[in-house]
Interface confidence: low
């Protein structure tokens, strides 16, 4: 099974070769290259020197080879970089190559969503309901769930809205939002609203959004 590697958008992934080199072979005898699942070449170290004639343009200038750890560093990660990678090592003979090592890695690229943000899109209407939008941007992969939490002095209610999502055509990052009409007919105390975004690994909470309800005015004194 391939080695699972996780790295973050715009950062660097380490794609290892995990070559034991039990024969203590010098890089100057070997051809080391990495290719992706479409057999496009990321990097080639040919007899100790990096060569670029076979490197695909989308990887050009984005890799660096660490000869101590036999690891390729892929920089400026994009979501589309996710997938399977192979490190292949050949021992160069004048008549051709002998494959002596192969290592498969599976790269997942993550991007942290921004902290959810609550924006009211209407004023409180006669203390009956408020329209809210909660949004979080520039994350990957898409989240599992987005919800709104209403907290009063006496109760906590969770509203699950329909999550709207859009994906950037270039970066492939997701923006997500939910819109809710929150009603509170009988609430007389102040209220705090939170927005929660759940991904496979994390639970992001918005800053609290407070609604201070005006206390009902007591009826004027009745003088008979």
């Amino acid at each position: 099974a391939p080695l699972k590697i996780q790295a973050y958008f715009n950062e660097t992934a380490d794609l290892p070769c995990q070559f034991a080199n039990s024969q203590n072979q010098s890089l100057s005898e070997l051809v080391v290259f990495w290719q992706d699942q479409e057999n496009l070449v990321l990097n080639e170290v040919y007899l100790g020197k990096e060569k670029f004639d076979s490197v695909h343009s989308k990887y050009m200038g984005r890799t660096s080879f660490d000869s101590d750890s036999w690891t390729l560093r892929l920089h400026n990660l994009q979501i589309k970089d996710k997938g399977l990678y192979q490190c292949i090592i050949h021992h160069k003979k004048p008549t051709g190559m002998i494959r002596i090592h192969q290592m498969n890695s599976e790269l997942s690229v993550l991007a942290n969503f921004s902290q959810p943000e609550i924006v009211p899109i209407s004023n409180i209407t006669e203390n009956v309901y408020i329209n809210l939008t909660c949004s979080s941007i520039h994350g990957y992969p898409e989240p599992k769930k987005m919800s709104v939490l209403l907290r009063t002095k006496n109760s906590t209610i969770e509203y699950d809205g329909v999550m709207q999502k859009s994906q950037d055509n270039v970066t492939e990052l997701y923006d997500v939002s939910i819109s809710l009409s929150v009603s509170f007919p009988d609430v007389t105390s102040n209220m705090t609203i939170f927005c929660i975004l759940e991904t496979d690994k994390t639970r992001l909470l918005s800053s609290p959004f407070s609604i201070e309800l005006e206390d009902p005015q007591p009826p004027p004194d009745h003088i008979p």
Partner: antibody
């Protein structure tokens, strides 16, 4: 059989540009890197750069950087080398040469075009 | 850039002679050296690759040796068709560079 057929001789004035073509046949065009090498009259061989037709990746000798452009047309299996701002010392025979298969460890130039004489003269 | 220095620059010899041409690289190029033969008005032809391996179809009288910085092309018994100019080339790193050539003439 593998063949690289180049365009005909050219006469250019200083400051002009020349575009030499190299049409490949007898093999899968996108599988092999094409290099350009020139030879001034009575002089030795000089490597100018290469183009990888599959990825459209180029690498140029820094001596020619900014003056040379290598392109390819996969529909006609043709590679082009354009040299601009020509001067008299660019008078030379220009060769295209096909590289062997890098994953067989063969980076040498196994097949060559017949050469194209470019004369730069006012 | 790696300099490839060939010697001699010209050489007169007779049919049947044994001839040696040398090529020195300005830095280690492993065995990434090739030798080409060129006749007037023609494109170069590959003779030797990886310093010591004959390309297919090249007669056995041609041999190559060396690694690191010093390389040799030997023609064991010159034939009339061998009179030409010979070039070494390194393809260890770009820019790929050639020796200045050795012109082999009939004595």
């Amino acid at each position: 059989q593998v063949q690289l057929v180049q365009s005909g001789a050219e006469v250019k004035k200083p400051g002009a540009s020349v575009k030499v073509s190299c049409k490949a046949s007898g093999y899968t065009f996108t599988s092999y890197v094409i290099h350009w090498v020139r030879q001034a009259p009575g002089q030795g061989l000089e490597w100018m750069g290469y183009i990888n037709p599959y990825h459209d990746v180029t690498k140029y000798n820094e001596k020619f950087q900014g003056r040379v452009t290598m392109t390819r047309d996969t529909s006609t299996s043709t590679v082009y080398m354009e040299l601009s701002s020509l001067r008299s010392e660019d008078t030379a025979v220009y060769y295209c040469a096909r590289q062997g298969d890098p994953y067989s460890g063969n980076y040498q130039f196994t097949y060559w075009g017949q050469g194209t004489l470019v004369t730069v003269s006012s | 850039d790696i300099q490839m220095t060939q010697s001699p620059s010209s050489l007169s010899a007779s049919v049947g002679d044994r001839v040696t041409i040398t090529c020195r690289a300005s830095q280690d190029v492993s065995t990434e050296v090739v030798w080409y033969q060129q006749k007037p008005g023609k494109a170069p032809k590959l003779l030797i690759y990886s310093a010591s391996y004959r390309y297919s179809g090249v007669p056995s009288r041609f041999s190559g040796s060396g690694s690191g910085t010093d390389f040799t092309l030997t023609i064991s018994s010159l034939q009339p068709e061998d009179f030409a100019t010979y070039y070494c080339q390194q393809h260890y790193s770009t820019p790929y560079t050639f020796g200045q050539g050795t012109k082999l003439e009939i004595k």
